[in-house]
Interface confidence: medium
Amino acid sequence: KSPVFGPQEVSSVEGNSVSIKCYYPPTSVNRHTRKYWCRKGASGRCITLVSSEGYVSSNYAGRANLTNFPENGTFVVNIAQLSRDDSGHYKCGLGINSRGLSFDVSLEVSQGPELPNGTEVYTVDVGRTVTIKCPFKTENAPKTKALYKKIGQTSVLVIDSRNYVNPNYKDRIRLRIPGTGQLIFTVVIDRLRLSDHGLYLCQAGDGSNRDEKNADLQVLEPEPELVYEDLRGSVTFHCALGLEVANVAKFLCRVNSRETCDVVINTLGKRDSAFEGRILLNPQDKDGSFSVVITGLRKEDEGRYLCGAHSDGQLQEGWPIQAWQLFVNEESTIPRSPTVVKGVAGGSVAVLCPYNPKESQSLKYWCLWEGAQNGRCPLLVESQGLVQEQYEGRLSLLQEPGNGTFTVILNQLTTQDAGFYWCLTNGDTRWRTTVEIKIIEGEPNLKVPGNVTAVLGETLNIPCHFPCKFSSYEKYWCKWSNTGCQTLPSQDEGPSEAFVNCDENSRLVSLTLNPVTRADEGWYWCGVKQGHFYGETAAVYVAVEEKKVAGSRYVSPAKADAAPDEKVLDSGVREIENKAIQDPRLFAEEKVVADTGDQAGGSRASVDSSSSEEQGGSSK
């Protein structure tokens, strides 16, 4: 399907002008290539009428032009002094007329209606309000005032000053007669319907002295605004329906093949399941305007959308509406990224979020979509740091890998973390994307002890076990803070042959803090990565306390919650006052605690990666 998009049907009246906007993917080639407007002939050939290279056919001379807007990926064809002869089938396109990079447009120019002399024309959108003004002479001031609608040769009474109201206009029409001295009465019709379209006659008095005034009421369906968005991107529909419906329920619906409109979302809490996790209805402003955001655009989201207001939260005739025609461009600049990311309870996920690479300096954000009522997306983390306290120690946003992608890591997963999350920036809003996190059965691949208590001034060693499948990955430890996770200096991992024949159950990367200081308290993450692409992580909290008994050197979990399956740490644990204290001999082997003396090189924090076998610890 061609990525060029424009209005399918354009209609106008003789003598008027039209402006036709066509959209194209704003690639470098497309921006600079020829743009054209051509008319399809009986033979199927399309004869150029106007092009971006300055050509204008003789038929269009002096009344048409084509303007390219390369920065927006649009071009506009303006045609003035329309005649009935201009009705026909056209194409707006790029490159060569026959190449297929084009969009079919039907132009219909009709003859203007034959109106009686002195007819006032009122042009109003469906659902809006019209005020018809009816002048009269002084002698008709006390006489009956009325408004008729002309249907063929007959006139049907609509309203009069004797309190008659035609049933078709019930509860939406009123006749106002001003005070003395003002020789004009008005008829106000609210919530206009398409069927209200037509010629009306105001009348004051009767007989040969009566005052008459013709009014032509043109009720228009709102012209859909064309919206051209990229696949996987985001669209915002801004809906401003006016103060008169500020307190009425609002909705967005999509027109179906039966020409009815299916509710996508409304303020009464209804939402189409096809948009679960990727739609928000923004709260109304005081003027009653609101907006609807849809992310993760799919080809099947294409179509005609209407927003409106009605107490039922769905489309009803005679209520104000706004319309859009959405085209989803499959030649998307937004890269593919997983829409579902799976993690296990206790494990972690690393989510890749795309952003516009031209906006590398923009702030990056991650929020949790909440479906209640109109939906909301409270911010969890941003590129400047964590925002929600309850995610302390387990959430971080990284600028890596960069160049159009950032990473969000969430660990210590629970079933409550399942849901939809949005990636966004404070730049190009079209690059908002949605990812669903699913929690599945399984065990975390990385195993660390439960929370650990370290002793001030001594050496702390924390093991992180990883399976063979991660042997080729880069292993790291980092200290979490609310602005990121600072990688700790890594010791040389020794000969690479250590991982070549990976027949053991797991391998080990150890974090050493030597000597432990008060500043070492906090969350530490063990993780694996490949280049700038992050994999799984595991978190451990290190509490720091004063030395309790002279000469004792132990590490104990702050809470007795050693990691499940942490069988290596299970042996040699004895209960003392409900606090698990591991046997120091075990740690000497397991490299959880070493001597208080400085390590080689005297490093404060270091990471050592080796196999369990080399450590002499029991394997799983």
Partner: nanobody, 120 residues
């Protein structure tokens, strides 16, 4: 639209203290992140301290331990308590608010700034 008005700047001797305040024209309860930034003559604007709606704070390394940021949602105000001031803290201090709409759109608002001069 959020208007931010800073106050509390002035001339102070080294090792002295100042308390900057930033009052927002609207409720700051819905403002996700508020922060103080500074710009010394001929230098780029830099972060001093920020505080999230969840109460999480973050400080530039150069001010850690000397400056404290706090927010008073009831008074729509953010404070920056500056102790142990140094001549290198001399700059125009700006208040910034990031308003995060549920649409995912973020609007950033800046105050006009207040001047802090630390003499040696």
């Amino acid at each position: 639209e959020v208007q931010l008005v800073e106050s509390g700047g002035g001339l102070v001797k080294a090792e002295g203290s100042l308390r900057l305040s930033c009052v927002a024209s609207t409720s700051i309860a819905s403002i996700n992140v508020m922060g103080w930034y500074r710009q010394a003559p001929g230098k780029e604007r830099e972060l001093v301290a920020r505080i999230s709606g969840g109460g999480i704070t973050h400080y530039a390394e150069s001010v850690e331990g000397r400056f404290t940021i706090s927010r008073d949602n009831a008074k729509n105000t953010v404070h920056l308590q500056m102790n142990g001031l140094k001549p290198e803290d001399t700059a125009a201090y700006y208040c910034k608010a990031d308003v995060f709409a549920s649409s995912g759109h973020v609007t950033t608002y800046w105050g006009q700034g207040t001047l802090v001069t630390v003499s040696s």
